[in-house]
Amino acid sequence: EEELQVIQPDKSISVAAGESATLHCTVTSLIPVGPIQWFRGAGPGRELIYNQKEGHFPRVTTVSDLTKRNNMDFSIRISNITPADAGTYYCVKFRKGSPDHVEFKSGAGTELSVRAKPSAPVVSGPAARATPQHTVSFTCESHGFSPRDITLKWFKNGNELSDFQTNVDPAGDSVSYSIHSTAKVVLTREDVHSQVICEVAHVTLQGDPLRGTANLSETIRVPPTLEVTQQPVRAENQVNVTCQVRKFYPQRLQLTWLENGNVSRTETASTLTENKDGTYNWMSWLLVNVSAHRDDVKLTCQVEHDGQPAVSKSHDLKVSAHPKEQGSNTAPGPALASAAPLGGSG
């Protein structure tokens, strides 16, 4: 009679984490008498996975009824596969012996690889806001995937970015892997509504990549432009001066009027006008009683935006001349040292 062969038909199988893996094994003869055992690995360090005769293997079930007299199928099913189950599994026939069974023949082995999905990518931006023309870094992380091969792309408003660096860890063997990527993005004044997207593609996702997003509204600070203008006279001794605060983001802004360097009024921006690009405009006005001044008046509009150092614009109001509309001076004036820092609300 032909000598028994142990046949493991599958050289390799791939199973998704959480599913069951079926490891096929058949023998070609009922002789010699003796049990089948399954091992992960070979040599002296191999691990027993299933023993037909003894032991408790809660995750392992046999595919066919091993108690049947003529059974030659010793396939097993391992439930709830995790990446830690990866390895080469050997079906080994033992010959009945005393006191111990004697290894008779091994199958060629079945390599089990485990597919595990990457976690949803998490995109994080810089801790502090940055202004247009500055380059900021975004990071994207995803974990727990297997096998190691993975593709990561960056987009800004649908346009693919090229300035990024990606690492997959660990470099060596692991049951699962992590990816970490850092992208550099140059901010523009129009980026309040922009999004940065990190896209991860992996064999387990069947062509439907995972995406993580970050809104540049969390990252960008667009500083305001200021314009101070004198309006036509409202009454004989009163002049209306307005400070137009344009194109700023985020909303948090505090404005202080100074007359000849002395604080006249402080107000926090409210009832803002939103522009199409997501920035805001705001206007503040000051009614100046010209008759209360003997000399010319220097009016300064000082704006503290989002906790940044104050910016200001000044306007010279001529008192000596008969009250009439004055031209505006839009040359930037220095932030006044006499003005105490003011915490805005927004």
Epitope: R40, A42, G43, P44, G45, V102, E103, S106, D173
Partner: antibody, heavy 122, light 112 residues
């Protein structure tokens, strides 16, 4: 193809600990045994021990009390530590890969590092 | 431990001629699965050992077919059908059946 590179100090003082690392490049740690073998000057080969990819270790009984082999799969490295060294531990130390795919035995030490000379001297 | 004994200690050879090295083990290396767990290695001068034969008779990848291994149980032989100049060095047998793995003392092959 797979390459192994030993690294560590070439000189160790008597009674101190010898520490060597072997870096595996161009291949996987999985499914292999990772071995340390030494060769004293002008003498034959002596097996120190090995570690399987699943972390199981096997040591030469003559050295077992002084030897620890560990595996860092994430770095594709394995290491040898030998305590209380004496001049008799002076040797070329090789790291090597051992195959296993047929039952309880081993199927050849098929990849070797180039060896690193360790001298034990004060 | 399994003791491995090699002979001869030294083997002067003539290029183109055959050569033979013997290795004996203190216990059988034939496992119940039918494999004999014995390896042969060649260590050329100044180099690391190189695997020639595993499981007694299987040639390792890239090894020229002039090298062959035979034997079973406790007696094993490495044959070189036609020695070449590059074959000089020390040949070692090693049992791979059980730990500790043990080597023979080596056979130094040199050109006459």
């Amino acid at each position: 193809q797979v390459q192994l590179q030993e690294s560590g100090p070439g000189l160790v003082r008597p009674s101190e600990t010898l520490s060597l690392t072997c870096t595996v490049s161009g291949g996987s740690i999985r499914n292999y045994y990772w071995s340390w073998i030494r060769q004293p000057p002008g003498k034959g080969l002596e097996w120190i021990g090995f570690i399987y990819y699943n972390g199981r270790t096997f040591y030469n009984p003559s050295l077992k009390s002084r030897v620890t082999i560990s595996l860092d799969k994430s770095k594709n490295q394995f290491s040898l530590k030998m305590t209380s060294v004496t001049a008799a531990d002076t040797a070329v130390y090789y790291c090597a890969r051992v195959r296993a795919y047929s039952g309880i035995g081993l199927d050849g030490t098929d990849v070797w590092g180039q060896g690193t000379t360790v001298t034990v001297s004060s | 431990d399994i003791v491995m004994t090699q002979s001869p200690l030294s083997l002067p050879v003539t290029p183109g001629e055959p050569a033979s090295i013997s290795c004996k083990s203190s216990q059988s290396l034939l496992y119940s699965n039918g494999y004999a767990y014995l390896d042969w290695y060649l260590q050329r001068p100044g180099q690391s050992p190189q695997l020639l034969i595993y499981q007694g008779s299987n040639r390792a990848s890239g090894v020229p077919d002039r090298f062959s291994g035979s034997g079973s149980g406790t007696d094993f032989t490495l044959k070189i059908s036609r020695v070449e100049a590059e074959d000089v060095g020390v040949f070692y047998c090693m049992q791979a059946l059980q730990t500790p793995l043990t080597f023979g003392g080596g056979t130094k092959v040199e050109i006459k």
